[in-house]
């Protein structure tokens, strides 16, 4: 009779984590008598997987009724996979021996190989906000893959970047994988409302990529530019000043106004004017009752905004320019009118 | 292809504790052994020990209390320790690759690193 | 342990003739399997070993076919059919079947 030959007839199988393996295994004979056993890895370091005859094997089952007087499938089904049962399977003859079993072939092996799907991209900013045209870094992490080739791309608002590096750690041999990304941005004006996304590519993902976003909003600072203007007399010997801030971003915003240096009134914005880039508009005035200056006034807006050094923008009122009612009283008086609709928002 | 690249001091002093490391590149750490083994000048092979993948660990008896043999897959490294050195330690110490895929036994030592000398001396 | 014995200690060979080399157990290498652990391996100057054979007489990748090993249980054959200039060196057997892995002492082949 032909000699007994120990069939494996997988010689790769890969299984997604959380799932079933079933590593097949037939013998070509009944003889000799005694029982099969499983191992992964081969030599002296070899780990037991199955005894047909002893051993307590929670996760493994075999496929077949080994009971049965004539069976000759002795695959065994690993349930609930995960990288670590990663490994070179062996399904192992033995014949019967005293005291001991005596190894008498071993099947050419299975390759078992685990799918882990990678951990959802977590993108994240720098700490600090970053004005337009500076360079900002966003990371990327993934983690819990396996097998270790994955793809890693950037985009900001649909556009792919090319300005990044990316690692995938460990370097060597692992049950499973990280991937770690930088990508450097350079900020625009009109980058409020963009968005930073990382796009993960793996074999376990079947085509549709893992996606981790960012929003520059949360990045960006847009400083306002200033503009003081002086508008037609509202009443006689009364100037309305207007300071126009526009397209900052954030929102906060602290603005005062000084009269030829000396503080005389700070308001926070409130109601803002968005505008479609996502950056906003503020205005606020004051009457100026010239009529109580002798001398030209040199009105400044102040602005702080997100607690950056303060800007400014300063108008001078020339006085000369609004005679004086005759008869009017010219002693020293409140030159800014400051009733509460007098500093305004619009 | 494999390479085994081995680092570590040339120079120990009697008594304080070898340690070379073994960095494999260009493939796999899984389903192998990893040796190491020396040769003193002019003398034959000695097998110190081994470990597999899976970290397991065999030693040559006649070294076991003084050798540790340890794998840092994630580095594709592994390392041999050797306390208590004396002299008679001086030699060439390669690490190299077993492979394993048929039984209890070990199909060859395929793969060796160049070797690095270490002389024991005060 | 298992001791590995290996004769000759030296070997002077002529180039293009054949050599033999031989490596004695003190147990039987020949496992239940039907394997026989044991290998050879070839230490040219200055070099690291090179493993020739493994299992008795499976010649390993990229070795010539002028090696050839032959034997089982404790006897065991290297040889080589027509001796080239750059087989000069040492030649180990190692049985690979229980650990502590043995080597023999080597056979010095030289040319004549």
């Known amino acids: 009779e032909e000699e007994l030959q120990v069939i494996q007839p997988d010689k790769s199988i890969s299984v997604a984590a959380g799932e079933s393996a079933t590593l097949h295994c037939t013998v070509t004979s009944l003889i000799p008598v005694g029982p099969i056993q499983w191992f992964r890895g081969a030599g002296p370091g070899r780990e037991l997987i199955y005894n047909q005859k002893e051993g307590h094997f929670p996760r493994v089952t075999t496929v077949s009724d080994l009971t049965k007087r004539n069976n000759m499938d002795f695959s065994i089904r690993i349930s609930n996979i995960t990288p670590a049962d990663a490994g070179t399977y062996y399904c192992v003859k033995f014949r019967k021996g005293s005291p001991d079993h005596v190894e008498f072939k071993s099947g050419a092996g299975t390759e078992l190989s685990v799918r882990a799907k990678p951990s959802a991209p977590v993108v994240s900013g720098p700490a600090a906000r970053a004005t337009p045209q500076h360079t900002v870094s966003f990371t990327c992490e993934s983690h819990g893959f396996s097998p270790r080739d994955i793809t890693l791309k950037w985009f900001k608002n649909g556009n792919e970047l090319s300005d990044f590096q990316t690692n995938v750690d460990p370097a060597g041999d692992s049950v499973s994988y990280s991937i770690h990304s930088t990508a450097k941005v350079v900020l625009t004006r009109e980058d409020v409302h963009s968005q930073v996304i990382c796009e993960v590519a793996h074999v376990t993902l079947q085509g549709d990529p893992l996606r981790g976003t960012a929003n520059l909003s949360e990045t960006i600072r847009v400083p306002p530019t200033l503009e003081v203007t002086q508008q037609p007399v509202r009443a006689e010997n009364q100037v309305n000043v207007t300071c126009q801030v526009r397209k900052f971003y954030p929102q906060r915003l602290q603005l005062t106004w000084l009269e030829n240096g000396n503080v005389s009134r700070t308001e926070t914005a409130s109601t803002l004017t968005e505008n479609k880039d996502g950056t906003y508009n503020w205005m606020s005035w004051l009457l100026v009752n010239v009529s109580a200056h002798r001398d030209d006034v040199k009105l400044t807006c102040q602005v702080e905004h997100d607690g950056q050094p303060a800007v400014s923008k300063s108008h001078d009122l020339k006085v000369s320019a609004h005679p004086k009612e005759q008869g009017s009283n010219t002693a020293p008086g409140p030159a800014l009118a400051s009733a509460a609709p007098l500093g305004g928002s619009g | 292809q494999v390479q085994l690249q081995e680092s570590g001091p040339g120079l120990v002093r009697p008594s304080e504790t070898l340690s070379l490391t073994c960095t494999v590149s260009g493939g796999s750490i899984r389903n192998y052994y990893w040796s190491w083994i020396r040769q003193p000048p002019g003398k034959g092979l000695e097998w110190i020990g081994f470990?597999?993948?899976?970290?397991?660990?065999f030693y040559n008896p006649s070294l076991k209390s003084r050798v540790t043999i340890s794998l840092d897959t994630s580095k594709n490294q592994f390392s041999l320790k050797m306390t208590s050195v004396t002299a008679a330690d001086t030699a060439v110490y390669y690490c190299?690759?077993?492979?394993?895929?048929?039984?209890?036994?070990?199909?060859?030592?395929?793969?060796w690193g160049q070797g690095t000398t270490v002389t024991v001396s005060s | 342990d298992i001791v590995m014995t290996q004769s000759p200690l030296s070997l002077p060979v002529t180039p293009g003739e054949p050599a033999s080399i031989s490596c004695k157990s003190s147990?039987?290498?020949?496992?239940?399997?039907?394997?026989?652990?044991l290998d050879w391996y070839l230490q040219r100057p200055g070099q690291s070993p090179q493993l020739l054979i493994y299992q008795g007489s499976n010649r390993a990748s990229g070795v010539p076919d002028r090696f050839s090993g032959s034997g089982s249980g404790t006897d065991f054959t290297l040889k080589i059919s027509r001796v080239e200039a750059e087989d000069v060196g040492v030649f180990y057997c190692m049985q690979a079947l229980q650990t502590p892995l043995t080597f023999g002492g080597g056979t010095k082949v030289e040319i004549k």
């Open positions: 470990i597999y993948y899976n970290g397991r660990t």
């Open positions: 190299a690759r077993v492979r394993a895929y048929s039984g209890i036994g070990l199909d060859g030592t395929d793969v």
């Open positions: 147990q039987s290498l020949l496992y239940s399997n039907g394997y026989a652990y």
